[in-house]
């Protein structure tokens, strides 16, 4: 009774998406094969229209307000392969029988997602579906799994039951179900997982929830194939025991209640040891396993936001693959790795925001480490090589600690201070809010990076040569918020500089840039230029794309660079409000609105 | 909640019969709207519904003479039917249908408003 | 299009009768129904929706019920109020269609 529908058609597809729509339409070409009826206000599916379109392979049936699904409304559609009934109101649908979506021969794919859905109108919902891989049930009010939640799915691989009110998965509830295995049960309410037996999962995540332990089957009748664990923000008080999951290769324990042990195990085996901690470290691999080198796998482990004090040196010998390690957010006084050998494989190591005073990395350990993240700790005295003993390290991050660079080679600095001269690999370092006083000559020599920051270290003094040996690599450099009066940098010969932020310190003049250069983006704002004249500015027009000059006691007159720049110029000089000048009369008005006639009177002749 | 009818009174034959409803205490664009018609002694014939998306829905019977439409800014759902005749007399109600379960029904009602098709 | 069939077509009850209404589809409407209430040069009243469900402010003198194709109303106890015309109307797909009507007048 909509005979025309504002539907668009191309081939074999239909997209009725936000129409309106109150019923399925009845006046479609009845050889679609994709119908998208999503975000329309359907309240039933009925056997008639829909059973018209019998070529039907993708139905999409999302956010509609569907509350009513006519027995055998989708048994015409013996071709249909993904039915989405997501966002409806399928909890309302109390008149179902059993098996209330009847039976779906060929559908792989099936997202009952967002229905506000319990558990038993769940089970009367499902009927057969033999060749179903996918189902979402997610962000719906189920509380618990039976062993008849999933029958009659041997095919199902994926299932994704997070946003539920999950407290109680019966024994045998995923028994039926001997092909899955990608399992999402995150955002639920469980609290313990004690006899986890799914050999054949390979991905599970049980994040956001209220699960204080993990444990294992004790008997596996086969080797666990699980891949991917994610247990953060849960109740975890010690690291797992994952002996029995020697393929694991992802694992999330972020978020967590975690303390590492500080003694020595009670126990040779390391597994079922008293309460310290142990019991959960994965020291050892059960008696029957191949492996024998529990994690041996792992490539990327998650501990930020927990508790760890300490890292055992045995914990780290196991790790021979790991590659990303995130410890942020944790306890730590120090970090050790010493040993050669020690993490040989790891890229990634974050330890940002721990209270670490000291780190003591051994000259061949970390070999293959290119980040390391070090923000927001205590770090003060390290041992002058701590970093140049990391042959691959590209990105390293100090942000927040103490550190006080040497100079170069020839110029030995304080004790206490730390060499960043000769780190070959180096390629970005943060020393943001370090205390530095004085930056030695040849700080970075044959270190070529292309970021630097040395931002938020007031008083800091910039030798002369400072930056020596950067000149060819590097492409940002940030000062911000140092109280420098004068720089000591030649920036015209830093060839590559794309971005230069000078922003609040005390600068009123800049180098004259004569030649062409890279600069891209310069930050002056909250500093003390009055003039900006074309003979010192005029090698940036050809680069120069944004320039921030907010809080500068920009003189009205002698500022025609500027003022061609705001009015047709290639640089976008931000300006959130208009840009404020003075004239010397200290008469205050936007530079866009000086005219050069302004600049005239009382003999004031605009110089540029 | 409210639904006030305008626009009724004598059409005369074969022009444009068109009827405005102005309602309040909800919004066009969470409820739908109906109109239905009742000749004198007669029952009820339900004449078109407008979706609170914009999906227009109309009786066979009438489909090729009428057009429903609405001005969520003022409102406002009009009808319009064309070519009327004296079959068309009758006490036109705009009603506004639930919003729960999966039926269409019409929970509040306007006074309706007496048209006239006479020469 | 779904028919709806009412009967009777009039009735004659007194005060405190027990009166019975049905409405029959030509299709399963799986409760898709609704009863109205007219009175002479009011518009309609709904007192019942899916089948058997009271609308708020409705006496529960009256109630809905039956499945499939088969819907009755009854009033329980009639009152001087209650002589009407009442209407039944399907609402499971348009185009919504309605019973003729059923007189309800005093004996």
């Known amino acids: 009774h909509q005979d025309k529908v504002p539907c668009k058609m191309v081939d074999k597809k239909v997209s009725c998406q936000v129409l309106g729509l109150l019923q399925v339409p009845s006046v479609l070409p009845p050889d679609t094969e994709t119908l998208d009826l999503s975000g329309n206000q359907l309240r039933s599916i009925l056997a008639s229209p829909l059973g018209f379109y019998t070529a039907l392979r993708h139905l999409d049936l999302s956010t509609n307000e569907i509350s009513f699904l006519q027995p055998g409304a989708f048994q015409a559609l013996t071709h249909l392969e993904h039915l989405s009934l997501a966002h409806n109101r399928l909890a309302m649908a109390t008149a179902l029988s059993a098996g209330g979506l009847g039976p779906l021969p060929r559908v792989t794919s099936l997202d009952l997602s967002g229905n506000s859905l319990y558990s038993g109108l769940l089970e009367r919902l499902l009927g057969e579906a033999p060749s179903l891989h996918t189902l979402s049930l997610a962000e719906n009010s189920l509380t618990r799994l039976t062993r008849h939640t999933f029958r009659d799915m041997p095919a199902l691989e994926q299932l994704d039951l997070h946003s539920n009110v999950l407290m109680d998965i019966e024994d045998g509830a995923f028994e039926g179900l001997p092909r899955l295995t990608h399992l999402n049960l995150s955002r639920n309410s469980l609290t313990c997982i004690s006899d986890f037996s799914l050999q054949q999962l390979r991905v599970l995540d049980l994040s956001c929830n209220s699960i204080e332990a993990f444990q294992t089957a004790s008997q596996p009748q086969a080797e666990f194939q699980l891949t991917w664990l994610d247990l953060r923000e849960n109740k975890l008080l010690h690291f797992p025991d994952l002996a029995a999951l020697p393929r694991l290769i992802y694992l999330n324990l972020s978020n967590n209640l975690i303390r590492l042990p500080t003694g020595p195990p009670q126990d040779s085996k390391g597994i079922h040891a008293p309460s310290e901690g142990w019991s959960a470290l994965p020291l050892s691999a059960p008696s029957g396993n191949a492996s024998g080198r529990p994690l041996s796998q792992l490539l990327n482990l998650d501990l930020s936001y927990n508790e760890i004090e300490l890292i055992p040196d045995s914990f780290l010998e196991h790790l021979t693959s790991l590659c990303f390690l995130n410890l942020s957010r944790n306890c730590l006084r120090t970090f050790e790795a010493r040993r050669l050998g020690s993490l040989p494989c790891l890229m990634l190591l974050d330890l940002s925001h721990n209270a670490l005073e000291t780190l003591e990395l051994g000259a061949r350990a970390l070999g293959s480490l290119r980040t390391l993240l070090l923000q927001g700790n205590a770090l003060r005295d390290l041992p002058p090589y701590t970093f140049a003993n990391l042959a691959s390290l590209q990105r390293l991050n100090l942000q927040g600690n103490r550190v006080s660079p040497c100079g170069g080679p020839d110029e030995p600095g304080p004790s206490g201070c730390v060499a960043f001269s000769g780190i070959t690999s180096l390629r970005s370092l943060s020393l943001v809010d370090n205390e530095i006083e004085l930056l030695r000559a040849g700080a970075f020599l044959h270190t070529p990076l292309t970021e630097l920051d040395l931002s938020s270290n007031p008083g800091l003094e910039v030798a002369t040569g400072a930056l020596g040996g950067l000149e060819a690599s590097l492409e940002v450099l940030a000062l911000q918020g140092n109280g420098l009066m004068v720089l000591q940098v030649d920036l015209p010969c830093f060839i590559c500089l794309k971005r230069l932020n000078l922003a609040e310190n005390r600068l009123s003049h800049l180098p004259a840039w004569t030649q062409a250069v890279s600069l891209e983006v310069l930050d002056l704002r909250n500093n003390s230029f009055s003039l900006l004249p074309g003979s010192a500015m005029g090698g940036l027009e050809t680069s120069l794309r944004r320039l921030y000059l907010q809080g500068n006691p920009l003189s009205c007159c002698g500022n025609g660079w500027l003022a061609a720049q705001l009015h047709q110029g290639r640089v976008d000089v931000d300006a959130t409000q208009d840009l404020i000048c003075r004239f010397s009369s200290q008469e205050e008005v936007s530079l866009s609105h000086v005219r050069p006639e302004d600049c005239e009177k009382g003999g004031l002749k605009n110089i540029n | 909640v409210q639904l006030v009818e305008s626009g009724g009174g004598l059409v005369k034959p074969s022009q444009t019969l068109s009827l405005t409803c102005t309602v309040s205490?909800?919004?066009?664009?969470?409820?739908?709207v109906s109109w239905v018609r009742q000749p004198p002694g007669k029952g009820l014939e339900w004449i078109a519904t407008i979706s609170s998306g914009g999906g227009t829905y109309y009786n066979p019977s009438l489909k090729s003479r009428v057009t429903i439409s609405r001005d969520t800014s003022k409102n406002q759902v009009s009808l319009k039917l064309s070519s009327v005749t004296a079959a068309d007399t009758a006490v036109y109600y705009c009603?506004?249908?639930?919003?729960?379960?999966?039926?269409?029904?019409?929970?509040?009602w306007g006074q309706g408003t007496l048209v006239t098709v006479s020469s | 299009d779904i028919q709806m069939t009412q009967s009777p077509s009039s009735l004659s009850a007194s005060v405190g009768d027990r009166v019975t209404i049905t409405c029959q589809a030509s299709?399963?409407?799986?409760?898709?129904l609704a009863w109205y209430q007219q009175k002479p040069g009011k518009s309609p009243k709904l007192l019942i929706y899916?089948?058997?469900s009271l609308q708020d402010g409705v006496p529960s003198r009256f109630s809905g019920s039956g499945s499939g194709t088969h819907y009755t109303l009854t009033i329980s106890s009639l009152q001087p109020e209650d002589f009407a015309t009442y209407f039944c109307?399907?609402?499971?797909?348009?185009?919504?269609?309605f019973g003729q009507g059923t007189k309800v007048e005093i004996k």
């Open positions: 899916g089948a058997g």
């Open positions: 109307q399907q609402g499971l797909k348009f185009p919504l269609t």
């Open positions: 299709e399963d409407i799986y409760s898709g």
């Open positions: 205490g909800f919004s066009l664009t969470s409820f739908h």
């Open positions: 009603a506004r249908i639930s919003g729960w379960g999966h039926y269409y029904v019409m929970d509040v």
